[in-house]
């Protein structure tokens, strides 16, 4: 009997109520592999989800996110709100990056400005909420008498050392 079921192709299921005949998957369901005893319910792309690929008898629907949101997780299991550059998502929604951090994308979290001094360099262009600092040559690399390209360091939040 098991052999009969294994002959049922994708898009069908092995119908125990009908002497293990291979029956087509009902509407809004699918089976992506052969030998299935049931068909899976198609995913519905509702709310913040939109359909990227319709469900067929052999494959599940694929969802995307509506405008203003982006996919998170395997197979776009969640839609996360977009933020503007210079912001990150928190429980309360989009918040500006804290001083010393930046985000140059519409998603993800704010991250610290690069620590130029780690590479023995100095800050050539100050960082902003949207952009990382630009590191330049170290003060020692500048010829004697040349003015340093490093702008004055901005005041820091207490307890933070972004540079």
């Amino acid at each position: 009997l098991q052999d009969l079921c294994s002959n049922c192709p994708a898009g069908t299921f092995c119908d125990n109520n009908r002497s293990q005949i291979c029956s087509p998957c009902p509407p809004n369901s699918f089976s992506s592999a052969g030998g299935q005893r049931t068909c899976d319910i198609c995913r519905q792309c509702k709310g913040v989800f939109k359909t990227r690929k319709e469900c067929s008898s052999t494959s599940n629907a694929e969802c995307d996110c509506i405008s203003g949101y982006h996919c998170l997780g395997a197979e776009c299991s969640m839609c996360e709100q977009d933020c503007k550059q210079g912001q990150e998502l928190t429980k309360k929604g989009c918040k500006d990056c804290c001083f010393g951090t930046f985000n140059d994308q519409k998603r993800g979290i704010c991250r610290p400005w690069t620590n130029c001094s780690l590479d023995g360099k100095s800050v050539l262009v100050n960082g902003t909420k949207e952009r990382d600092v630009v590191c330049g040559p170290s003060p020692a690399d500048l010829s004697p008498g040349a003015s340093s390209a490093t702008p004055p360091a901005p005041a820091r939040e207490p307890g933070h050392s972004p540079q």
Epitope: K91, K95, C110
Partner: antibody, heavy 121, light 112 residues
Framework: EVQLVQSGAEVKKPGSSVKVSCKAS????????IYWVRQAPGQGLEWIGN????????FYGEKFMGRATFTADTSTSTAYMELSSLRSEDTAVYYC??????????????WGQGTLVTVSS | NVMLTQPHSVSESPGKTVTISCKLN????????VHWYQQRPGSSPTTMIY?????PDGVPDRFSGSIDSSSNSASLTISGLKTEDEADYYC??????????FGGGTKLTVLG
């Protein structure tokens, strides 16, 4: 599988320094904050600071500014915390922890096993 | 300074329900997510509740989290207490998105 594996226990003299390592595996090391948290015997959790390994950017708790230094070696996916001018009150278990990139106020989803640092003369 | 205050200890009998509170002293408890960690002696903290009320895979549904804006506090509730639940529990939130804040911890004793 994501893992954070820390270096072994240390016994240090007052006034000296200690460097604790935290080797990450199972994820892209440069794309997640590593936080450093400590716990004195019988006490609660205390934030020391954090590093973004992607560019070496750091933040320090006010209490630890000037004494703690965080670095990251991206070639070995290892974060380091060095604490200088040690005193007996620094005796604690030191943890590294990873924060997901979902939101700016997210939880710590993976923790190292902890490193006991004992400061004693 | 932002502080999260937890009771030092709570105790209850097996099978009962216990609630651990986490009160924010200033600001709005709804501004940032609250997370809860369990720590057994000699072990690292593990997440029991994240983002106010979500349970990681593998955490029993006996554990639940909630936020009460009227008391400016978060709560961790454990129902059907088991002896294995005996541990320290810590709440965690933020002062700013780069400054995490922890509660002082609550020692849960399951009465034998």
């Amino acid at each position: 599988e994501v893992q954070l594996v820390q270096s072994g226990a240390e016994v240090k003299k007052p006034g000296s320094s200690v460097k604790v390592s935290c080797k990450a595996s199972g994820y892209t090391f440069t794309s997640y904050y590593i936080y450093w948290v400590r716990q004195a015997p019988g006490q609660g959790l205390e934030w020391i600071g954090n590093i973004w390994p992607g560019n070496g950017g750091t933040f320090y708790g006010e209490k630890f500014m000037g004494r703690a230094t965080f670095t990251a070696d991206t070639s070995t996916s290892t974060a380091y915390m060095e604490l200088s001018s040690l005193r007996s009150e620094d005796t604690a278990v030191y943890y590294c922890a990873r924060r997901p990139d979902y939101s700016g106020d997210d939880y710590f989803d993976y923790w190292g096993q902890g490193t006991l640092v004992t400061v004693s003369s | 300074n932002v502080m999260l205050t937890q009771p030092h200890s709570v105790s209850e009998s097996p099978g009962k329900t216990v609630t651990i509170s986490c009160k924010l002293n200033s600001g709005n408890i709804g501004s940032y997510y609250v997370h809860w960690y369990q720590q057994r002696p000699g072990s690292s903290p593990t997440t029991m509740i994240y983002r106010d009320d979500k349970r990681p895979d593998g955490v029993p549904d006996r554990f639940s989290g909630s936020i009460d804006s009227s008391s400016n506090s978060a709560s961790l509730t454990i129902s059907g207490l088991k002896t294995e639940d005996e541990a320290d529990y810590y709440c965690h939130s933020y002062d700013s998105t780069i400054t995490p804040v922890f509660g002082g911890g609550t020692k849960l004793t399951v009465l034998g």
